[in-house]
């Protein structure tokens, strides 16, 4: 009831407490001498549902029937209305509705730990809208039993805050808890264990690896654990995998060997515990452990490619190039790769390590036989070396691949598709492709890619460096034995106009015709391979079509005659590049007049 | 047991607003009514608005449009966000969370509206 109700009551049968679906009468009655003044027999009662009026009568008191009330709290309130004044608050009234409490169900318990207490949980069923207390019951052997309440609101776990001893690990406890609230009251069905059903022990703590003698082959996990635990897994992984192997060992007392782990990577490790083979629950897993394995010394070989490159008479250049191992061949840092240049005939040899580069260019004489090793080292050893024959790779023309075409093939890749070479095409051993970036100084300093190809194949996809609107020099070389054939063509994965035309530096007279000089358009404005320079002319101040003059893209080309001039007539000239996707805008105009007589 | 502890009364002129709060201590509110109820000089206790568990409010014809409650479970806190008051709305105001074991009460607080 609403407190100091001064003016009247307001009165809830059968209960101010109901179950869903009931039915209450509430009456609203005055205090004598509490109704209208003067005007007793013109009170006028109204009850309010909250700000919802329900029903009225005039008279010293109100009955009313009130059915279909939701769950939760309603509030009723009496008012009085006289005539001329404003309703006046007599008395109010909550009505709880609700339901009583569900059987609790799925009742667990666990103890955390050997030193742990035990903790019970279960599931409420559905809400009461009614403040519902939960009693948990323990009972043991010899009669003990102890018991907690829970006064939260929504109450579904208890702790005893009492501690299961492994004296007797096959005694039997009993664990009920029972849901009162004012409509009724509901209790679980018991649930029965022993020590060895409900101790969880704690995760496995103080985890340490260790190698002997820096081996990976001879790894033990080392841990510390609670003392009854028998079983335990192993859960360990690659640092950045999301696969764990998974061990089961028993009996393992705080240590294990591992045999399987791969060199120099870095691993987490986890272990969780058990008491008992097929009683009770595991552990939480312990917190990680985070351990590097030692280095083993690399497998594999090298992939190494080389460019030869004519000094003069006497000398030619030799530029080696090799990839990286990959993380599991190189099983540590590389340290260094250790190049062998040798001289077959004359058993001359120079050894040299290479750090931070895996390019390396010498100046060797012409003459001679020369071959290479070349090996990658970590702190554990070196891998196998690769060796190859230094030999003019194009120089045999019966072995050089035909119809090379170079498509685009997507975003920043370019396919090369070639025939065999007509030398019969089962001498051929491996193809390799070679891509760089095309500078039209035959810059030396330009990255160079390769991949190699099975001999039985026609065709690969580029992809590794290769960016957009750059055009990119590609040559096919067929390998056997110690010759080789190449063909070239040049390539892009995606093209557009070039930005910018020629630049003309220098136009020259030369009996009677012209030569006209160029700058070569910068490489980032080309966007793509140039097929085509066109140069244009026309007379100065004509309104006529210029004329023009196409030339076929060579990458070390910059001048061109042009012999239609006429003498004595000054023209405007300028020049633009193509690509397949289009022509460039004008580079600049030059006048030109030439002084020579007419034919 | 619940305790409340109302707090936002003062001194205001006609016309102005006031923002009221009671914030309680124990979980078991969050499944009850939350209430506003307000004492005038010489008069009873008299109900002004109410917000169920699901947030459903309602107002006493004298409170309505003027007056809003809200309420925020997490911090156990119900709220009257008093606009344009008028001198008869000069009382001390309660909170109240009533309960099917009994109703609980705030001290209160005063609010004043001068004309």
């Known amino acids: 009831k609403i407190d100091a109700c001064k003016r009247g009551d307001v009165t809830v049968k059968p209960s101010h407490v109901i179950l869903l679906g009931s039915t209450v009468n509430i009456t609203c009655s005055l205090k004598p001498r509490q109704g209208c003044f003067h005007y007793s027999r013109r009170n006028k009662l109204i009850l309010y549902k909250f700000d919802r009026r329900i029903n009225f009568h005039h008279g010293h008191s109100l009955n009313s029937q009130v059915t279909g009330l939701p769950l939760g709290t309603t509030l009723f309130v009496c008012k009085l209305a006289c005539i001329n004044s404003d309703e006046i608050q007599i008395c109010g009234a909550e009505i709880f509705v609700g339901v009583a409490p569900e059987q609790p169900q799925n009742l667990s318990c666990i103890q955390k730990g050997e030193q742990g207490t035990v903790a019970c949980t279960w599931e409420r069923g559905r809400d009461t809208h009614l403040y519902t207390e939960y009693t948990l019951q323990l009972s043991g052997p010899k009669n003990l039993t102890w018991q907690k309440q829970c006064k939260d609101i929504y109450c579904d776990y208890l702790d005893f805050g009492i501690n299961l001893t492994p004296e007797s690990p096959e005694s039997n406890f009993t664990a009920k808890v029972t849901a009162v609230n004012s409509l009724g009251s509901s209790s679980s069905l018991p649930s029965t264990f022993t020590f060895l059903d409900i101790v969880r022990p704690l995760p496995p703590w103080d985890i340490r690896i260790k190698f002997q003698k820096a081996s990976v082959s001879r790894c033990t996990l080392y841990w510390r654990d609670e003392g009854l635990v028998l079983l335990n897994r192993l859960r360990y992984r690659p640092s950045n995998s999301r696969l764990w192997n998974m061990v089961n060992v028993t009996k393992a007392k705080g240590r294990h060997d591992l045999l399987d782990l791969k060199p120099f990577t870095e691993y987490e490790f986890q272990i969780s515990s058990k008491l008992h083979l097929y009683k009770g629950s595991w552990s939480d897993w312990s917190e990680s452990l985070r351990a590097q394995t030692p280095e083993e010394e690399p497998t594999g070989m090298l992939d190494v490619w080389y460019m030869k490159r004519h000094i003069d008479y006497s000398r030619q250049q030799i530029s080696l190039f090799w990839k990286n191992l990959s993380v599991s061949e190189a099983r540590g840092k590389i340290l260094h790769y250790q190049v062998t240049l040798q001289e077959l005939t004359g058993g001359k040899a120079m050894t040299q390590n290479i750090t931070g580069h895996t390019s390396w260019t010498t100046v060797i004489p012409r003459t001679g036989n020369w071959a290479v090793a070349v090996s990658a080292a970590n702190s554990k050893g070196s891998s196998l070396p690769t060796r190859i024959n230094i030999m003019n790779l194009c120089e045999a023309g019966l072995l050089a691949p035909r119809q090379v075409s170079a498509n685009s093939e997507g975003m920043d890749n370019i396919l090369v598709t070639w025939q065999p070479p007509r030398k019969d095409p089962s001498a051929v051993q491996e193809y390799v492709v070679e891509w760089r970036e095309l500078h039209p100084g035959g810059d030396t300093q330009v990255p160079l890619n390769w991949l190699r190809s099975r001999p039985y194949n026609v065709s690969a996809l580029i992809s590794e460096n290769i960016k957009s609107y750059i055009c990119y020099e590609i040559r096919v070389y067929a390998l056997s034995g110690d010759q080789g054939g190449c063909s070239s063509i040049l390539g892009n994965s995606k093209h557009k106009a070039p930005l910018s035309g020629p630049h003309i530096n220098a136009i020259t007279e030369e009996k009677g015709s012209i030569l006209i000089s160029w700058n070569s358009i910068p490489v980032q404005e080309q966007m793509g391979c140039l097929l085509h320079y066109r140069i244009y002319w026309k007379e100065r101040d004509s309104n006529s079509q210029p004329q023009l003059c196409e030339i076929p893209y060579r990458v070390s080309q910059n001048s061109h005659p042009i012999n239609s001039l006429q003498p004595r007539v000054t023209y405007v000239l300028w020049m633009t590049a193509l690509t397949a996707a289009g022509e460039s805008s004008h580079g600049n105009e030059r006048e030109f007049c030439l002084q020579g007589k007419a034919n | 047991q619940v305790q409340l502890q109302e707090s936002g009364g003062g001194l205001v002129q006609a016309g102005g607003s006031l923002n009221l709060s009671c914030t309680a201590s124990?979980?078991?509110?969050?499944?009850?009514?939350m209430d506003w109820y307000r004492q005038a000089p010489g008069n009873q206790r008299e109900w002004v608005a109410s917000?169920?568990?699901?947030?459903?409010?309602y107002y006493d014809g004298s409170a309505k449009g003027r007056f809003t409650i809200s309420r925020d479970n997490a911090k156990m806190t119900v709220y009257l966000q008093m606009n344009s008051l008028k001198p008869e709305d000069t009382a001390v105001y309660y909170c109240?969370?009533?309960?099917?074991?009994?109703?609980?009460w705030g001290q209160g607080t005063q609010v004043t509206v001068s004309s």
């Open positions: 124990g979980s078991i509110i969050s499944i009850y009514n």
């Open positions: 917000i169920t568990s699901n947030g459903d409010s």
């Open positions: 109240k969370v009533p309960t099917e074991n009994g109703n609980y």
